[in-house]
């Protein structure tokens, strides 16, 4: 009998607290082999999947879920779970995102976090600097 | 059942160009990164290039032998992956398979391929 | 880019037997490897991912082994369907690379 898989992690970038119609972006890391991401809500009746799978480090895995333009409606819990070899992980603890105007935000744009897992890193899809025109994320209206 | 059936493969000129299609069945296609893969006749296996998911911002990459002459990209409206191929060289000669990765870069599902002939 | 080296292209053996096929990187690429089968005139089958890991269906006569650089791809009875070519790769970085293949042949 195979032990229980690792709990996922999440994470936001960049970060949790978000002006509205500013992007964000959560990030789901778990162990290598991961098959699947998924992405819930707090209540669990709504998710989004992903298949598309970086290689974080050398001992992870993990997977994007972008929001083009926040709004009041992104607001809530969040908590990510994956497959690995059919079975389903437990789920990561949860990620409270905020929606609110902060301090400056209308003088100083927001910049965009590196997609990158760190300088001492070769994740697999980070390793190019290239990239197809910046087109749209996953919007909030597709996310949930 | 995943299928993924490409075409567009033929017989051109070298310095023309060819757009390879991949119509994709069987799965969700729009969470998925997809990648071209060829084969030279008689020759091993070569990656050519992969596009990620919206979520990704459709970020692209390609293999040194076809980059700024090669561009990837989907359409996830009709689940179709496509390849344009420009300033084709003899070397480009190959069969190209349409490929869905697992796991980040494991090449899980495979089609059954175009053949595509560069010569004068 | 890494490169991956399979030492062998070709390998003459006997029903039976016992292969074991070697593949190296030039770098470490922390167990994102995947083993590949391609008979003659097929298209290739993923048979083991992230170094060990066994595909749905493949039979349990492969394994894989390995880590940091140095892979392995065994089979404990060689049986006529398993005559084709095995490929590597990693998928650790991109440009993704495979290793040239070796090729099995009966005896």
């Known amino acids: 009998q195979e032990g229980p898989l690792p709990r996922p992690s999440i994470s936001a970038e960049p970060g949790t607290v978000i002006p509205p119609g500013r992007p964000v972006t959560i990030v789901c890391r778990g162990p290598v082999g991961v098959d699947q991401f998924r992405l819930e809500r707090e209540d669990r009746s709504k998710f989004n999947d992903t298949k598309d799978v970086s290689q974080a480090s050398p001992s992870e895995s993990e997977a994007r879920f972008r929001i083009d333009s926040v709004s009041e409606g992104n607001a809530g819990h969040y908590r990510c779970l994956y497959v690995k070899s059919t079975r389903w992980s437990e789920h990561s603890d949860y990620l409270d995102l905020v929606v609110k105007e902060t301090s400056g935000d209308t003088d100083s744009p927001v910049t965009e976090p590196d997609s990158s897992a760190g300088p001492t890193q070769r994740p697999s899809d980070n390793s190019h600097n290239e990239h197809a025109p910046a087109s749209q994320g996953l919007s909030a209206e597709h996310l949930y | 059942e995943v299928q993924l059936v490409e075409t567009g493969g033929g017989l051109v000129q070298p310095k023309g160009s060819l757009k390879l299609s991949c119509a994709a069945s069987?799965?969700?296609?729009?969470?998925?990164?997809m990648n071209w893969v060829r084969q030279a006749p008689g020759k091993g296996l070569e990656w050519v290039a992969r596009?990620?998911?919206?979520?990704?911002?459709?970020?692209?990459y390609y293999a040194d032998s076809v980059k700024d002459r090669f561009t990837i990209s989907r359409d996830d409206s009709e689940s179709m992956l496509y390849l344009q191929m420009n300033n084709l060289k003899t070397e480009d000669t190959a069969m190209y398979y349409c490929?869905?990765?697992?796991?980040?870069?494991?090449?899980?599902?495979w089609g059954q391929g175009t053949s595509v002939t560069v010569s004068s | 880019d890494i490169q991956m080296t399979q030492s062998s292209s070709s390998f003459s053996v006997s029903l039976g037997d016992r292969v074991t096929i070697t593949c190296k990187a030039s770098?470490?690429?922390?167990?994102?490897l995947a083993w590949y089968q391609q008979k003659p005139g097929n298209v290739p089958r993923l048979l083991i991912s992230s170094a060990t890991s066994l595909e749905t269906g493949v039979p349990s006569r492969f394994s894989g082994s390995g880590s940091g650089k140095d892979y392995t791809l065994s089979l404990t009875s060689l049986q006529s369907e398993d005559v084709a070519t095995y490929y590597c790769q990693q998928y650790w970085t991109i440009p993704y690379t495979f290793g040239g293949g070796t090729k099995l042949e009966i005896k």
């Open positions: 490929v869905r990765d697992r796991y980040g870069g494991a090449m899980a599902y």
């Open positions: 770098e470490d690429i922390y167990n994102r």
């Open positions: 069987g799965f969700t296609f729009n969470i998925n990164a």
């Open positions: 596009i990620r998911t919206k979520n990704n911002n459709y970020a692209t």
